[in-house]
């Protein structure tokens, strides 16, 4: 069951190591790949005192975990190098970070974890 | 510390109905999409199913098409796997896997024994 | 109906190197299909080696490696140690929520 899938068929592009790489340094890809897979758009950047530094933005290869996510929000607690994907067309142009932290539930049976 | 524990597991009748329970601890669960793995006692492993971070969409493999149904509750860090019209084929050990960016499984549970007899 | 195979037994002496295979029926393997090896000792969950092709998992020696060979996903063990007696499983990724497993490969450490 799929609901309110959206495909993504263009991604913002920007590459910080473009000389090296030989690439564009920032336009727009077109996502390519076989029709019966997804794609998705991503971007990783790193936060160096406080000042965002862009690494890269493309298009992001079929990805369950980037299925359902119309925006490009990194939630994961203090990554070393912030990373987040979607789907829809230039849909990383803008990303955020927002983390969550776990949630733990009580619980009235407490489970001994197995070493 | 990633914990990942099945149960609801046991032994039914064919025809019979389960409904397996996979709680994840030691990561934020509703970041991440989930599977169901088993493995038929002597024999390989076989992917079961897989739901997307927020259970909008939801993957079974054909043989359990129709009969089971894959759902999360990310407000209580829990997986689900109900089956129904349980075969004796589907007898087997059933783990739930977390599964990280580029589609791999991280982190599996202990499993939990599916047993389908008369 | 996608079938993934691997050898399904494999020996390698204590020391030697092996190197276990993952190929699919409709077609070449590349990185597209996240391969990713897991390998499991009976009785216990699988343990997560080798994903996205050529990646090791935390924790997993220097001794396993992940490649493309040709048109298949390979796992290469050097130095082959007697607790590396286990199945190995690859898994790829087809798309769309699909996930393939091999039907698992028995590694035996000679002596």
């Known amino acids: 069951a799929i609901l309110g899938r959206s495909e993504t068929q263009e991604c913002l592009f920007f590459n910080a190591n473009w000389e090296k790489d030989r690439t564009n340094q920032t336009g727009v890809e077109p996502c390519y790949g076989d029709k019966d897979k997804r794609r998705h758009c991503f971007a990783t950047w790193k936060n160096i005192s406080g000042s965002i530094e862009i690494v890269k933005q493309g298009c992001w290869l079929d990805d369950i975990n980037c299925y359902d996510r119309t925006d490009c929000v990194e939630k994961k607690d203090s990554p070393e190098v912030y990373f987040c994907c979607c789907e829809g067309n230039m849909c990383n142009e803008k990303f955020s970070y927002f983390p969550q932290m776990e949630v733990t539930q009580p619980t009235s049976n407490p489970v001994t974890p197995k070493p | 510390e990633v914990q990942l524990l099945e149960s609801g597991g046991g032994l039914v009748q064919p025809g019979g109905s389960l409904r397996l329970s996979c709680a994840a601890s030691g990561f934020t669960f509703r970041n991440y999409a989930m599977s169901w793995v088993r493995q038929a006692p002597g024999k390989g492993l076989e992917w079961v199913s897989g739901i997307s971070v927020t259970g909008g969409s939801t993957y079974y493999t054909d043989s359990v098409k129709g009969r089971f149904t894959v759902s999360r509750d990310n407000s209580r860090n829990t997986l689900y796997l109900q089956m129904n019209s349980l075969r004796a084929e589907d007898t087997a050990v059933y783990y739930c896997?977390?599964?990280?960016?580029?589609?791999?499984?991280?982190?599996w549970g202990q499993g939990t024994l599916v047993t389908v007899s008369s | 109906q996608t079938v993934v195979t691997q050898e399904p037994s494999f020996s390698v002496s204590p020391g030697g190197t092996v190197t276990l295979t993952c190929g699919f029926n409709s077609g070449s393997v590349s990185t597209s299909y996240y391969p990713s090896w897991y390998q499991q000792t009976p009785g216990q969950a699988p343990r997560t080696l080798i994903y996205n092709t050529n990646t090791r998992s935390s924790g997993v020696p220097d001794r396993f490696s992940g490649s493309i060979l040709g048109n298949k996903a390979a796992l290469t063990i050097t130095g082959a140690q007697a607790d590396d007696e286990s199945d190995y499983y690859c898994v790829l990724y087809m798309g769309s929520g699909i996930w393939v497993f091999g039907g698992g490969t028995k590694l035996t450490v000679l002596g």
């Open positions: 896997a977390k599964v990280y960016y580029s589609s791999f499984f991280d982190y």
